[in-house]
């Protein structure tokens, strides 16, 4: 080994990665939540919509408080891969109706990715465990109807903008702690 | 700039024991996870444990797990390699890194012969 | 046997582009696990060269980038220099090892 030197700074560390995942969080939600309300003006929703391969709401408020940085982190990087993959989904699998979305659809796609990479990047900063992100639970086949996969495009954007809303607290709460 | 500048090589029999450590500065320790990697003379880099930024989660490589213990102390800006029962396999320069791992110290040479 | 597999070898004349592959499976590049790059020159200790695929650390030259599809990455270096011959080393976390594993390291020549 040659003499001790210094290495210079990376771009980022570990902080500045969790404030690049906040803003990135942000970011998506606002996107995410401008596309909701495209998607009920142009087709409005009778009622609420669900996918069983959709994951669960992984935090409420009440439980905001006892948070642990590997535990958000996992579920989110595993969360947001699935929401990822259905968005990926819809936009192979949507039908003429859902077409004039696609730019939008597409951004979506693009700023999920940037933020996965960021929440990974994170991860392997802090050496926390990273789990392989599932598949879905329930294979995406296409939709049987042009109705089906605008019911199932509310069900994405409502389920994706709960998640993003915690994960903004969530990622808050955790610069407290970092 | 980022220093991590590790110590505690040299030649050890084998079965016999070694304590590597590895001081840090210029970086906010207490925000990496910390590794330790190996190079054995001539071949390629060999991962070998890992420690979180606060040292809850711990992983080591199969050919280490039961006889390295990594450990760091965040008060000293410390990282360590307790090394035991030690093989003529485990011959390699130590290195220390951190984060990805982003930054890597110089390394520590460990010889196991008889 | 390394994890990743990259070609022992590679070479090329200054000014050339080469390229520098890295395989993996399932369980890491496979599965979302970003991929990143090191350089070690002769004697001295590795260097982070890409990291998450394709971003590069600060001072380091737009001439390397990086590329990660399915289950393979590469590396690719343009306008190749002398002072680029060195070993360059592969990396991406593993599920089933639950750590990093790196690639056997490719060597690289420039003619």
């Known amino acids: 080994p040659g003499p001790p030197a210094g290495s210079p700074r990376v771009s980022s560390d570990p902080r500045a990665d969790l404030d690049s995942a906040v803003l990135l969080t942000r970011s998506l939600l606002a996107d995410t939540r401008q596309l909701a309300a495209q998607m009920r003006d142009k087709f409005p929703a009778d009622g609420d919509h669900n996918l069983d391969s959709l994951p669960t709401l992984a935090m409420s408020a009440g439980t905001l408080g006892s948070l642990q940085l590997p535990g958000v982190l996992t579920r989110l990087r595993v969360d947001l891969m699935s929401y990822f993959r259905h968005v990926q989904w819809l936009r192979r699998a949507a039908g003429p109706s859902l077409k004039t979305l696609e730019p939008e659809l597409g951004a979506l796609q693009a700023r999920l990715e940037r933020l996965l990479r960021r929440l990974q990047l994170l991860m392997s900063r802090l050496a926390l465990p990273q789990a392989a992100p599932d598949q879905p639970a329930v294979p995406l086949g296409p939709p049987a109807s042009a109705w089906g996969s605008i019911r199932a495009a509310h069900a994405i954007l409502g389920g994706l903008h709960l998640t993003l809303d915690w994960a903004v607290r969530g990622l808050l709460l955790l610069k407290t702690r970092l | 700039e980022v220093q991590l500048l590790e110590s505690g090589g040299g030649l050890v029999q084998p079965g016999g024991s070694l304590r590597l450590s590895c001081a840090a500065s210029g970086f906010t320790f207490s925000s990496y996870g910390m590794h330790w990697v190996r190079q054995a003379p001539g071949k390629g880099l060999e991962w070998v444990a890992v420690?979180?930024?606060?040292?809850?989660?711990?992983y080591y490589a199969d050919s280490v797990k039961g006889r390295f213990t990594i450990s760091r102390d965040n008060s000293k800006n410390t990282l360590y390699l307790q090394m035991n029962s030690l093989r003529a396999e485990d011959t390699a320069v130590y290195y220390c890194a951190a984060g990805v791992p982003d930054y890597w110290g110089q390394g520590t040479l460990v010889t196991v012969s008889s | 046997q390394s994890v990743l597999t990259q070609p022992p070898s590679a070479s090329g004349t200054p000014g050339q582009r080469v390229t520098i592959s890295c395989s993996g499976s399932s369980s890491n590049i496979g599965s979302d696990y970003d991929v990143h790059w090191y350089q070690q020159l002769p004697g001295t200790a590795p260097k982070l060269l890409i990291y998450?695929?394709?971003e590069r650390p600060s001072g380091v030259p737009d001439r390397f980038s990086g590329s990660k599809s399915g289950t393979s990455a590469s590396l690719a270096i343009s306008g190749l220099r002398s002072e680029d011959e060195a070993d360059y080393y592969c990396?991406?976390?593993?599920?089933?090892?639950?750590?990093?594993?790196f690639g056997g390291g490719t060597k690289l020549t420039v003619l």
């Open positions: 420690i979180s930024y606060d040292g809850s989660y711990k």
């Open positions: 998450s695929n394709n």
């Open positions: 990396a991406a976390w593993d599920s089933s090892l639950s750590g990093p594993v």
